[in-house]
């Protein structure tokens, strides 16, 4: 479902979108994921924000915790018990990193329709979560894990040596949060709760990287943050498993790393449980191109975790790193030793694998010229999982359900033929068993949530379709919309133009190409989206591309580890090439071509405006990385190696921003960065500025104090506002 | 509005068994999830059991091997076998939706006392 463009009676009454459509969010949609509490049960919030119950089976719903309660702690989120006795509410919410926060918490009870008094929860605390059966809790507080048996008992501490910045225990520190997990946790409960197992970090001997937080005091504050930077030290990690029926009876004990991990500096991936006695880990080499999935059971005679050599699979790459952008976890089957994990395949093309024994006699579950995405469930007769299987678009999700009770195995397209114009990108959330599952659909229409039945597929009732948004959009002259590809050098390069609404192939337009290119990242989708870019074709008249090039995901292996040790090379040329394509269409006025990133994609940004093609008249850089040495290892170095001289040295300082500062000379290159970046720090910009300075070429640029890698709040208008400008005072558009 | 009524408690020695029913009516069907909760003198009022609609059952801790819950969904009936009984199990017990609906509509419980 795309809202009707212009071709309609009322062609007077439509108006362009406007900068302040996009500035207050006019046209944002909403997704319902129900809150599974059961296989057929599920908890949402009310728009007067009741939580209710809802019954799929019965029809029925009714509330279990009032507006009135929540209101009364300030309450912005809320967990029931597994045991449905209690509900945390959590306030006071205060953003730490990306995924991480701190908050306060209440426990109510809801037998007896009051808070819970008595050894009350420390504030403020960083991580808190129910047991998965009854209503144990662990929290962390102070980087220290505390345990209780019931909410109004007394905690057990179960670590000691916590310490800001030096020992995270049960939440990552900003690396792995970043990075590798990526969570705000490190803890994990066994599925019935009898186990608990916690990451410990320690961060002692990493460097610290110190910028100015400048607040409303007379002196700026300094933030400290551990952060490793390519080929820095890194944290050390070790993983734990204490027992919460008797914690203080044996005490945690450590789970062991696998020998041909722990010989070299590594990182620990994932920990999945199996069953109450039998635990998953996940290690990656430093080196990221060797990962060791190793599967331990509880020694009741020891009360130790055994790791036998048997039970190590290991994964390499030879072409690359290890996985896609993260190594894929494992799915366990009902035998509890057995797994279905996402890995590249001999023809280079991320695919479903059955693990029985060893990874050498994996049986392949899915095969092609295409990639899957990710398992969402497995049960005793079916896997679901996502790919970009349907018509050969890589930019699409669909829903697939194998049926893995029957030989051979049958596939069925869930999602494939719903509502096939408007949903071509889906994601799904599955009640326990699978007995319902709610679909997501992103677009390329009006993004609309479902219900629908595990067992026959059949849809039951629409959870949301963002009726009001269509309406909004009615008298809205939307851009076009194309995904196409183009092919070039035995390369396909997938784009996404965005097109003004009287969009006329005989006339001549500006160009706006939006990059992001990092690795493994994909920009071409087949999404709902009313952004900022939407606004520039729409009221400005402008041509917008988005190009998926060399590094970019779910193509295969091949494009995937093209920058491979080469990062800032092929992802630009694409871009490049791909400009060169849209000058041949002949609608593109090439002496009004820009480019524009954020992150990664200001790096790209960057590069391209710097390469000397004359090309692009003007550009953005967002926050961009400017050097690799600047940024974090984990990221860095799994795709560019170490920057030392027996491994890759030469090419981190090859692929410098700043070493390009001359050829910034015919461009406009606007460059903007928050001074409180905690992930691309401002050193990158400060760099190129300085680089740009020494070189004697001119350049505007904007900082946004106390701002982070977002640019959230008021900056955020300020940006677009600002950026805007830029782009109408390149092309000559008049204000 | 659902009526709950709630029926065979009594006074029993400990050790001994009681089971306890619960006839649901009303505009809500009794095959939405329910529990059993109970309050004893001078204490809040806390769960003993739930059960699903699909049948699976959760239990508190203090009870697990000695209840059990079970349903009836043509009677629209729910039922707790209470054995092994202890003085400590000595309460006012309840049926309700698990977790209880708000505002909570609680019916007149059935008295179990259980003597040494």
């Known amino acids: 479902l795309r809202p009707s463009r212009v071709h309609n009676s009322e062609e007077n009454t439509m108006r362009a979108l406007t900068l302040k459509d996009i500035l207050n969010g006019t046209f944002s949609y909403k997704t319902f994921f129900p809150n599974w509490i059961s296989g057929q049960e599920y908890l949402h919030q009310s728009a007067d924000n009741n939580i209710v119950l809802y019954n799929i089976e019965t029809g029925q719903s009714y509330t279990i915790l009032s507006n009135r309660t929540m209101k009364s702690v300030n309450a912005s989120n809320y967990g029931l018990s597994p045991d449905r006795q209690f509900v945390y509410l959590e306030s006071d919410y205060s953003k730490l990193w990306r995924y991480s926060y701190t908050a306060t918490y209440y426990i109510y009870d809801l037998s007896n329709g009051e808070f819970v008094r008595g050894n009350e929860l420390p504030r403020p605390i960083q991580y808190l979560c129910w047991s998965p059966v009854g209503s144990k809790l662990a929290y962390v507080y102070q980087n220290n894990i505390y345990l209780k048996q019931r909410p109004g008992d007394p905690p057990f501490q179960i670590t000691f040596n916590g310490r800001e910045n030096k020992i995270f225990n049960g939440i990552p520190d900003w690396v792995y949060e970043e990075e590798m997990l990526p969570t705000k946790y490190a803890l994990w409960w066994s599925p019935n709760g009898k186990f608990l197992a916690y990451a410990e970090f320690n961060d002692k001997d990493i460097p610290v990287i110190a910028y100015s937080y400048y607040g409303d005091e007379q002196y700026p504050r300094t933030i400290n943050i551990p952060y490793p930077k390519a080929g820095a030290k890194n944290p050390v990690v070790r993983i734990f498993i204490i027992d919460t029926t008797y914690p203080a009876y044996v005490g945690p004990q450590e789970v062991p790393v696998p020998a041909m991990i722990a010989s070299s500096d590594y990182y620990f991936s994932w920990l999945t449980w199996v069953t109450d006695e039998r635990v998953c880990l996940q290690w990656l080499k430093r080196v990221q191109n060797v990962s060791v999935l190793s599967i331990c059971d509880f020694r009741e005679d020891w009360q130790t975790w055994d790791c036998p050599k048997t039970q190590e699979h290991i994964e390499e790459s030879r072409t690359g790193w290890a996985g896609g952008f993260f190594v894929s976890r494992p799915v366990f089957s009902y035998d509890a030793i057995s797994y279905y994990k996402i890995f590249s395949d001999k023809d280079g093309y991320k695919h479903i694998h059955y693990i029985k024994d060893t990874v050498e006699n994996a049986i392949q579950i899915t095969s092609g010229k295409w990639e899957a995405i990710n398992i969402f469930r497995v049960t005793q007769d079916s896997l679901f999982y996502s790919s970009n299987e349907f018509e050969e678009y890589p930019g699409r999700r669909n829903i697939y359900r194998i049926s893995i009770g029957s030989y051979p195995p049958s596939k069925k397209c869930v999602t494939c033929h719903l509502r096939k114009e408007r949903c071509q990108y889906y994601t799904a959330s599955f009640s326990d068993y699978a007995k319902y599952y709610a679909l997501v659909c992103y677009g390329p229409g009006i993004p609309i949530s479902t219900l629908h039945d595990g067992r026959t597929d059949q849809e039951i009732k629409i959870l949301e379709e963002n009726k009001e948004l269509e309406n909004a959009l009615k008298n809205i002259q939307l851009p076009k919309e194309e995904i196409k590809k183009l092919e070039v050098d035995e390369i396909t390069l997938w784009y996404k133009m965005i097109l003004p609404p009287q969009f006329d192939r005989s006339k001549k337009y500006p160009l706006l190409i939006q990059v992001y290119g990092g690795p493994c990242s994909q920009s071409v989708r087949s999404v709902f989206a009313v952004n900022w870019i939407s606004y520039l074709a729409s009221k400005e008249g402008m041509v917008i591309a988005l190009v998926d090039g060399r590094g970019t995901a779910f193509q295969g292996d091949k494009l995937l580890y093209a920058v491979y040790r080469k990062l800032g090379v092929y992802e630009v040329e694409d871009q490049i090439t791909a400009v060169r394509k849209f000058i041949e269409m002949g609608f593109i006025d090439e002496k009004r071509i820009a480019i524009w990133g954020w992150s990664y994609g200001g790096y790209v940004s960057s590069l391209a405006l710097a390469s000397g093609t004359g090309l692009f008249k003007c550009g953005i850089a967002v926050a961009p990385v400017s050097s690799w040495e600047y940024y974090a290892s984990v990221y860095t170095e799994r795709f560019m190696g170490l920057p030392t001289k027996d491994d890759n040295l030469e090419h981190y300082k090859n692929s410098t921003v700043m070493a390009r500062a001359e050829y910034f000379r015919n461009v406009d290159y606007l460059l903007i960065h928050g001074t409180a970046d905690d992930n691309v720090h401002f050193q990158n910009s400060a760099q190129i500025a300085k680089a740009l300075v020494n070189a004697q070429v001119d350049f505007q640029a904007m900082w946004y104090s106390d701002q982070n890698h977002g640019l959230s709040g008021l900056s955020t208008n300020h940006l677009y506002t600002h950026m805007t400008h830029f782009l109408k005072q390149c092309f000559s558009l008049s204000d | 509005q659902v009526q709950l009524q709630e029926s065979g408690g009594g006074l029993v020695q400990a050790g001994g068994s009681l089971r306890l029913s619960c006839a649901a009516s009303g505009t809500m069907s009794s095959i939405n999830a329910m529990g059993w909760y109970r309050q004893a003198p001078g204490k809040q009022r806390e769960l003993v059991a739930g059960i699903l609609s699909d049948g699976t059952t959760k239990y508190v801790e203090s009870v697990k091997g000695r209840f059990t819950i079970s349903r009836d969904n043509a009677k629209n009936t729910v039922h707790l076998q209470m054995n092994s009984l202890k003085v400590e199990d000595t309460a006012v017990y309840y049926c309700?939706?698990?977790?209880?609906?708000?505002?909570?509509?609680w019916g007149q419980g059935t008295q179990v006392t259980v003597s040494s």
């Open positions: 309700n939706f698990f977790p209880p609906p708000v505002p909570a509509s």
